[in-house]
Amino acid sequence: ECGHISVSAPIVHLGDPITASCIIKQNCSHLDPEPQILWRLGAELQPGGRQQRLSDGTQESIITLPHLNHTQAFLSCALNWGNSLQILDQVELRAGYPPAIPHNLSCLMNLTTSSLICQWEPGPETHLPTSFTLKSFKSRGNCQTQGDSILDCVPKDGQSHCSIPRKHLLLYQNMGIWVQAENALGTSMSPQLCLDPMDVVKLEPPMLRTMDPSPEAAPPQAGCLQLSWEPWQPGLHINQKCELRHKPQRGEASWALVGPLPLEALQYELCGLLPATAYTLQIRCIRWPLPGHWSDWSPSLELRTTERAPTHHHHHHHH
């Protein structure tokens, strides 16, 4: 080991200067007694090295790169050795940015997986290894006073979401939640969310079904459809409102929305539709009047209206 590089900082802000020193030991006797130390950044030779002999006989070259504009590069010091360049030492230089404040943090409570799933936007590329940690604590009040800390949630590499398992959650009690981003140039924290996991619950949608025709029931009127839905059982005790959407299967018509419908309606007659037309229908629900998130739309149900001309055009429902 004839040479050794030391740098002012191996990781810097992109565009910042960096100073490096290369020292060649005196006992490298096979070398030229007054060797010329050369610098190379990546494949490019870098002028501007200031070389001096130190009192102990070692040779030192110092270089200042005014702007490191590469996000990653190798800096090496070398000597001319015959017809080739003999590399004495090299260091990896990294340049990038400190992490921006993570934003748009939001969470959903999934009652099936029993976990609180939080996601965020990490902000612009830092060009440096940056870790994200979802941090949280339990709070009795409005998150001004911090209770027990909850185990940090660390997402898999490259992911901007993390799941806090049920054992770390307290339902019907507020939690403070935020994201911390960290790399070699700094740390940033998102604004804190204060939420009760149940207030961000996302339910599963009901299953739409065709209403079984019963002998005593009148058949659907022209331009009407009779349908029913089966609520998602684990969410049955949560008060909800639902909405239905429908559109003709053919053509470019957009979805028409019907609602709000009470989850408990369970059956519904939808009128004012085109006769003899196949329709696609979907339903979704949300916890209500308490806070929550809309469920996904249910799988589609496809139904056809009767042949005759429609007699009236309005929505109504039967309990």
Partner: antibody, heavy 118, light 107 residues
Framework: EVQLLESGGGLVQPGGSLRLSCAAS????????MGWVRQAPGKGLEWVSS????????PYADSVKGRFTISRDNSKNTLYLQMNSLRAEDTAVYYC???????????WGQGTLVTVSS | DIQMTQSPSSLSASVGDRVTITCRAS??????LNWYQQKPGKAPKLLIY???NLQNGVPSRFSGSGSGTDFTLTISSLQPEDFATYYC?????????FGGGTKVEIK
């Protein structure tokens, strides 16, 4: 403070009828599912029936289906259980309970004893 | 129907003991498992809901764990007032079934 007060229990002959009531106070009755759970002497707990907040959904245990009817009057904050065609095996303490959003029985009444015997 | 099997049906323990009661569902119920305590002549009382959430006012020596089909109620240090019968109940799907109960008696 949540309070549930059952009434209407007593001695009835097999084949007879009885109507249990549960008066609720201390919470917004119309927002919660309610239910009945019974316990035969010296036995465990048995779910009987539940009713949704507006009364539209009413599941029943197979053992009482077709004989018992659960209902509620949200204007009176009262839950009911109409019990017809009573059998000896219906003898139990009947508890009225308020359900939570996750199906848990959050609060229970003190119970009313129904004895079916000739 | 989802059947609930509770074990043991009874146990004897001393004040200060750690007590564990298990409940097994005949099929997966996610975390929809609740635990109740009942003392003779009294109505049941909710202890734990959704497998691990402590009901307000219940001492922290009670805890619940598990998901899917296997669940546990633990009393970390048994107190004199804890001698009672404990029931589990699934609330994932109707009909709601209770476990057969576990009677915790003084040794």
């Amino acid at each position: 403070e949540v309070q549930l007060l059952e009434s209407g229990g007593g001695l009835v002959q097999p084949g007879g009828s009885l109507r249990l009531s549960c008066a609720a106070s201390g919470f917004t009755f119309s927002l919660y599912w309610m239910g009945w759970v019974r316990q035969a002497p010296g036995k465990g707990l048995e779910w009987v029936s539940s009713i949704s907040s507006s009364g539209g959904v009413t599941p029943y245990a197979d053992s009482v289906k077709g004989r018992f009817t659960i209902s509620r009057d949200n204007s009176k904050n009262t839950l009911y259980l109409q019990m017809n065609s009573l059998r000896a095996e219906d003898t139990a303490v009947y508890y009225c309970a308020k359900l939570g959003e996750l199906g848990q029985y959050m609060f229970w009444g003190q119970g009313t004893l129904v004895t079916v015997s000739s | 129907d989802i059947q609930m099997t509770q074990s043991p049906s009874s146990l004897s323990a001393s004040v200060g003991d750690r007590v564990t009661i298990t409940c097994r569902a005949s099929q997966g119920i996610s975390s929809y498992l609740n635990w109740y305590q009942q003392k003779p002549g009294k109505a049941p009382k909710l202890l734990i809901y959704y497998a691990s959430n402590l009901q307000n006012g219940v001492p922290s020596r009670f805890s619940g764990s598990g998901s899917g089909t296997d669940f546990t109620l633990t009393i970390s240090s048994l107190q004199p007032e804890d001698f009672a019968t404990y029931y589990c109940q699934q609330s994932f799907y109707y009909p709601f079934y209770f476990g057969g109960g576990t009677k915790v008696e003084i040794k």
